[in-house]
């Protein structure tokens, strides 16, 4: 986990101000509106699961 302004988050994660930590880009599949998803350089999330 990285503080803002320090080294970037590891591959597959992006900084979340809401969570105050690096968050998994993979979770954008289920929660595409999370604040960190814009920072994820992955393809658009798969269809939302229920």
């Amino acid at each position: 986990e990285q503080a803002p302004g320090t080294a970037p988050c590891s591959r597959g994660s992006s900084w979340s101000a809401d969570l105050d930590k690096c968050a998994d880009c993979a979770s954008c599949r289920a929660r595409p509106h999370s604040d960190f998803c814009l920072g994820c350089a992955a393809a658009p999330p798969a269809p939302f699961r229920l």
């Epitope: 998994d24 993979a26 979770s27 289920a30 393809a43 798969a46 699961r49």
Partner: antibody, heavy 119, light 111 residues
Framework: QVQLQQSGGGLVQPGGSMKLSCIAS????????MSWVRQSPEKGLEWVAE??????????HYAESVKGKFTISRDDSKSRFFLQMNNLRAEDTGIYYC??????????WGQGTDLTVSS | DIVMTQTPASLAVSLGQRATISCRAS??????????MHWYQQKPGQPPKLLIK???SLESGVPARFSGSGSGTDFTLNIHPVEEDDTATYYC?????????FGGGTKLEIK
């Protein structure tokens, strides 16, 4: 540090009710989805119920085996959540864990509480 | 529901050797980018502890002796070299859809 402190559980007669509670600290509770997972020798680890966050309209989901019997709820102002269990049967016996997940994996876990349904 | 089948149910591995645990899902739990498979370790009297998320991503604080691989329906947890402290039961879990389901567990004994 992160803590999930559980209370409730014990012995209940078939057809009876029980309410489990879980108080969270050390993380942004309101942003997380919360679940109950139970464990028994017969069925192993079994996800029971989930309640999502305010941004997901507090949506709830249940395992088919507990639909209509169990109700999950949360109180973000006090960082706690609950499992109300009604019409309990012997097959509901097990260790119940509260757990948090941002979306996919169960990250933080409570210490577990035993529920025994028996006459 | 997606059925998670773990093999073997138990195994004994000599100290310092490799332990390999397999988990097969009854349908694919992967997109082109990520696999929605996770691994946990559970010791007696304790809750499960997250080891690996998204098939291969090591959880913070977990020793690099643990590694995960696989995609689609077939996944593997490797522990190498095994240590005494690794005596536990290991579980896989998918988060592809609701209901989330777990494998039946693999009990690891260190010889």
């Amino acid at each position: 540090q992160v803590q999930l402190q559980q209370s409730g559980g014990g012995l209940v007669q078939p057809g009876g009710s029980m309410k489990l509670s879980c108080i969270a600290s050390g993380f942004t509770f309101s942003s997380y989805w919360m679940s109950w997972v139970r464990q028994s020798p017969e069925k192993g680890l079994e996800w029971v119920a989930e309640i999502r966050s305010k941004s997901d309209n507090y949506a709830t989901h249940y395992a088919e085996s507990v639909k209509g019997k169990f109700t999950i709820s949360r109180d973000d102002s006090k960082s706690r959540f609950f499992l109300q269990m009604n019409n309990l049967r012997a097959e509901d016996t097990g260790i119940y864990y509260c757990s948090s997940t941002y979306a996919d994996y169960f990250h933080y876990w409570g210490q577990g509480t035993d529920l025994t349904v028996s006459s | 529901d997606i059925v998670m089948t773990q093999t073997p149910a138990s195994l004994a591995v000599s100290l310092g050797q490799r332990a390999t645990i397999s988990c097969r899902a009854s349908q694919s739990v992967s997109t082109s980018t990520y696999s929605y498979m996770h691994w946990y370790q559970q010791k007696p009297g304790q809750p499960p502890k997250l080891l690996i998320k998204y098939a291969s991503s090591l959880e913070s604080g977990v020793p690099a002796r643990f590694s995960g691989s696989g995609s689609g329906t077939d996944f593997t947890l490797n522990i190498h070299p095994v240590e005494e402290d690794d005596t536990a039961t290991y579980y896989c879990q998918h988060s592809w859809e609701i209901p989330y389901t777990f494998g039946g567990g693999t009990k690891l004994e260190i010889k």
